[in-house]
Each structure stands twice: as structure tokens, then as C-alpha cells.
């Protein structure tokens, strides 16, 4: 099949880091600057995305792979890829459309990105407050008031958790 | 590539509960919130909470404080939404997303689970 | 608590240009996001922070958001836009939906 495949369609020999010229009688011919095919049978090679302002090239093109962004100190990415910078607060802040703001009483943000988050209510879920929370962490929750009875041995609460917000793998 | 998937439907009566699980897979469990959204009948789409899979840590939407109970089980990289004393206006789809911090929006989704309550 | 406004429905002919409103009290000082929802499937980012695109939307999307209201526009709508639209923002604790707007192509 590959081979029927190849010889209806001379483009699909074309590897990445290359596109198939039209105006060559299609012969494979390399990207030009700042422009790649990552995959192979490309009629065309993409535009380079270029990191300027606030993006600082974390990868740079090649001839088979795109650049890849990501933002300078007292910024940081959002979305798939980086395709935005955002600024960066203080843990306990969040930013607003205003700047950086303090988190009001019962919110927490122990992360520089994000919004000011409800501190967990433990009774919700049936729990007791282990440690009480803060504007840089959230309250952590134990076991439910039922369970701390007299002799019960001590529980030692988890050491405070990472938020999310992180990258996909 | 980024997965939520979520378990089968389910049909339950009036009072009863019922625990929903939503697989993630593609990207570190304990990095992105779950919320979970519902969704009735030709009806829109109505939060119902989250949970930080990193520390457990939960908020849910007022109406449905008491009876909402969200829990992970960060070894299969999966969360539970349970609902109980379940009433008619429960039947909807409920959705798992995931939230990659910041301000809260939903970039991945769940497939949906349909709840019915009937008696 | 928050609420965000839409219209019920909107019509558009193929080729023109949609424009679906998201009403809320000073929405402008809010980030807001929208979904696209296709009948029997689950809802699809569209734009997120105000303006921002996913990777994959087309750049026929686009929105905007300043005082009371934020607007979804898609220009050069085809045939597979036909769908419902729901705008969302982060409200004192709380994510908030807009009640939706089935778009619908003529």
C-alpha cells in the first residue's frame, strides 16, 4: 500500500523538514528560514512562531519543529503552549483586571498565578479543621469530630499541598 | 493527549445516591483542578464544585452544600462526585473538566454521565 | 449571587457575521470564557481571558468584554457553527454559566 501510495502521490516521500515544491515538478525541497514541516508530505512548511515582548524562546525552531515560548521572570503562561503571558503576584494576591490584590478573609492562593480560592469547608465533608488556613493556604482537614475520641493516637497534618496549574505532561 | 473519562450512566430512585468517577489521563493528576458541571434536559449548564486532587481540598456551589461530597483516589488518577437523597430535578448529565488554574475555565471535559431519577 | 444575561437564540446567514451578547453587572472588570456545545456532546472552549483562542478554534472566532457586556463574534459562519454558545466567569467563590444561545444557521 505504501508503495501503490508513493508512486500516485511523489509528495508523500517528502520527510519532515521539507515540503513538497509544485513549482519544482514536486521535488522535495527544505523549509526556508524560520519556517518547518514536522511531519512528512507537507505541500507547505509553517511559519516559525517567534517569542518577542514579554515570551522568551524556551526552544528554538528547526527545520522540523516549531519554537516554543514561555514568559520572562514576573510572568507566567497561560493556555496550551504558552500562548499567552500573564503577571505574576504575590502568594495571597490574586491578579484583577486592577493588579495584584490581597485575598479577602477565608480565601487563599499559595500559588504567584490564579485567583484567591475558598478556604475547604472540612464540615462539608463530614471532616474536622486540622490547621486553619491562611491567605497562602488552604485549611487542612482531618478526620470528622467523631473520630477524635479520647486515646485516639494524634494525627500529624500532611505538610501543605502544591496547588494545581501546572503544564500537561 | 489529555482524557477525562467518565464512568456509565445510571438510573436511580428518588432519596438514593449516586457516585459518578472521572479517569484522567495525559498530563500529571494532582496539576489541574476537576470541576464538576451538570446539565438537566434542555437545560444549560450549571456548576457544581470542584476538588484540588493534590490536597483534597473541595468547594462546592451553595445549593448544593450537604449534599455534595467530592473525593480522589490519586493512585488511579481519578475523582467522585456523589450526590445523595437524589430528587427528580437531579436527572441531568453531570461532566467532569479540568481546570489548569488561574482564572477558572474548563479546557478539557468529560464525555458525560446521565443520571436519571426515576421511580 | 452573579448572573450573566444571553439571548435565547440567534440567527445568521451562512457567510455573515454572529454576534452573541453575555450580560452581567461590570462584566468588564471580569475575565470571562465560552464554550461551544454541539447537541449530544460535551462543551467545547472557544475563547478564554476575554479575547484569547484555543488552539484549533478558527480565527473566525473572536470576543471582546468591557462594561456591562462581553461578545462572542464569529465571522464568515458556516453550516458547523450551528450550536449553543455559554459564556462563564469566576464570581466571589463561584463559576458562573450564562443561560446559553443556540446559534442557528439559516
Known amino acids: 500500500f505504501e508503495r501503490t501510495r508513493s508512486l500516485q502521490d511523489p509528495c508523500s516521500n517528502c520527510p519532515a523538514g521539507t515540503f513538497c515544491d509544485n513549482n519544482r515538478n514536486q521535488i522535495c525541497s527544505p523549509c526556508p528560514p524560520n519556517s518547518f514541516s514536522s511531519a512528512g508530505g507537507q505541500r507547505t512548511c509553517d511559519i516559525c512562531r517567534q517569542c518577542k515582548g514579554v515570551f522568551r524562546t524556551r526552544k528554538e525552531c528547526s527545520s522540523t519543529s516549531n519554537a516554543e515560548c514561555d514568559c520572562t521572570p514576573g510572568f507566567h503562561c497561560l493556555g496550551a503552549g504558552c500562548s499567552m503571558c500573564e503577571q505574576d503576584c504575590k502568594q495571597g494576591q490574586e491578579l484583577t483586571k486592577k493588579g495584584c490584590k490581597d485575598c479577602c478573609f477565608g480565601t487563599f492562593n499559595d500559588q504567584k498565578r490564579g485567583i484567591c480560592r475558598p478556604w475547604t469547608n472540612c464540615s462539608l465533608d463530614g471532616k474536622s479543621v486540622l490547621v486553619n488556613g491562611t491567605k497562602e493556604r488552604d485549611v487542612v482537614c482531618g478526620p470528622s469530630p467523631a473520630d477524635l475520641s479520647p486515646g485516639a493516637s494524634s494525627v500529624t497534618p500532611p505538610a501543605p499541598a502544591r496547588e494545581p496549574g501546572h503544564s500537561p505532561q | 493527549q489529555v482524557q477525562l473519562v467518565e464512568s456509565g450512566a445510571e438510573v436511580k430512585k428518588p432519596g438514593a445516591s449516586v457516585k459518578v468517577s472521572c479517569k484522567a489521563s495525559g498530563y500529571t493528576f494532582t496539576d489541574y483542578y476537576i470541576h464538576w458541571v451538570r446539565q438537566a434536559p434542555g437545560q444549560g449548564l450549571e456548576w457544581v464544585g470542584w476538588i484540588n486532587p493534590n490536597s483534597g481540598g473541595t468547594n462546592y456551589a451553595q445549593r448544593f452544600q450537604g449534599r455534595v461530597t467530592m473525593t480522589r483516589d490519586t493512585s488511579i488518577s481519578t475523582t467522585y462526585m456523589e450526590l445523595s437523597r437524589l430528587r427528580f430535578d437531579d436527572t441531568a448529565v453531570y461532566y467532569c473538566a479540568s481546570d489548569p488554574g488561574g482564572n477558572p475555565y474548563f479546557d478539557y471535559w468529560g464525555q458525560g454521565t446521565l443520571v436519571t431519577v426515576s421511580s | 449571587s452573579y448572573e450573566l444575561t444571553q439571548p435565547p437564540s440567534v440567527s445568521v446567514a451562512p457567510g455573515k457575521t454572529a454576534t452573541i451578547t453575555c450580560g452581567g453587572d461590570?462584566?468588564?472588570?471580569?475575565?470571562v470564557h465560552w464554550y461551544q456545545q454541539k447537541p449530544g456532546q460535551a462543551p467545547v472552549l472557544v475563547m478564554y481571558?476575554?479575547?484569547e483562542r484555543p488552539s484549533g478554534i478558527p480565527e473566525r472566532f473572536s470576543a471582546s468584554n468591557s462594561g456591562n457586556t462581553a461578545t462572542l463574534t464569529i465571522s464568515r459562519v458556516e453550516a458547523g457553527d450551528e450550536a449553543d454558545y455559554y459564556c462563564q466567569v469566576w464570581d466571589s467563590g463561584s463559576v458562573v454559566f450564562g443561560g446559553g444561545t443556540k446559534l442557528t444557521v439559516l
Open positions: 481571558y476575554d479575547s
Open positions: 461590570t462584566i468588564g472588570s471580569k475575565v
